[in-house]
């Protein structure tokens, strides 16, 4: 829980807490911004990002963005607040412990994005259909 000496000295809205009143600590994410990638036509890929960061804000989750155009493939890894859009898209899967890629419509390129909320979960990005969250059994696993 929030220690009284901390609580008194700062506005409560600057400290994020969970339902039990425990202070929400930030998670760890791979954070290499945009890098060229060799990940293509695979069920899953590792990010090959060597930088693990403590997210700046406790509410932030891990995000990965995979993009392919005529010239190259890139993978972006960051922390991001799920209340805010990223690349103009809502992070609808932010509560997932795994980073399960979903295709998004972007003109001129193939664009996949995933978000997740466990430490370094954007290190392993999953494209395989067997992980699709339209499967109700998987939803049970994710949200238990």
């Amino acid at each position: 829980t929030i220690p009284p000496h901390v609580q008194k000295s700062v506005n409560n809205d600057m400290i994020v807490t969970d339902n039990n009143g425990a202070v929400k600590f930030p998670q760890l994410c791979k954070f290499c911004d945009v890098r060229f990638s060799t990940c293509d036509n695979q069920k899953s890929c590792m990010s090959n990002c060597s930088i693990t960061s403590i997210c700046e804000k406790p509410q932030e989750v891990c995000v990965a963005v995979w993009r392919k155009n005529d010239e190259n493939i890139t993978l972006e890894t960051v922390c991001h607040d799920p209340k805010l859009p990223y690349h103009d898209f809502i992070l609808e899967d932010a509560a997932s412990p795994k980073c399960i890629m979903k295709e998004k419509k972007k003109p001129g390129e193939t664009f996949f994005m995933c978000s997740c909320s466990s430490d370094e979960c954007n290190d392993n990005i999953i494209f395989s259909e067997e992980y699709n969250t339209s499967n109700p059994d998987l939803l049970l696993v994710i949200f238990q």
Epitope: T1, D18, N20, A22, V23, F25, Q144
Partner: nanobody
Framework: EVQLLESGGGLVQPGGSLRLSCAAS???????QMWWVRQAPGKGLEFVS?????????YYADSVKGRFTISRDNSKNTLYLQMNSLRAEDTAVYYC???????????????WGQGTLVTVSS
Amino acid sequence: EVQLLESGGGLVQPGGSLRLSCAASGFTFGTEQMWWVRQAPGKGLEFVSRIDSPGGRTYYADSVKGRFTISRDNSKNTLYLQMNSLRAEDTAVYYCAKRRPTGVSGTFYDYWGQGTLVTVSS
């Protein structure tokens, strides 16, 4: 009863060094994830550094990378923060905290020390 007691704070000039300690008792220190968290006057919490157990992997906020080093001595139940190349913006109350899952997914509990004040000023 879980207790965390920080020490080692004080007044230091910019560019100087300090070593903070956190003496832990009332729990099995060697199995816990431990953090240093700071709070500058009138500001929110900044999560400075984390050390895992087992394995001792360490992580740092971008603002302190390359300057601060977190470590632990499990035989002494003590957590440390070595702070070098200190800057005025490092002025804050520094807390050690422990955090672990309750077993319910996404739910954690945490314990905090009383904090130690670090002032960086010429």
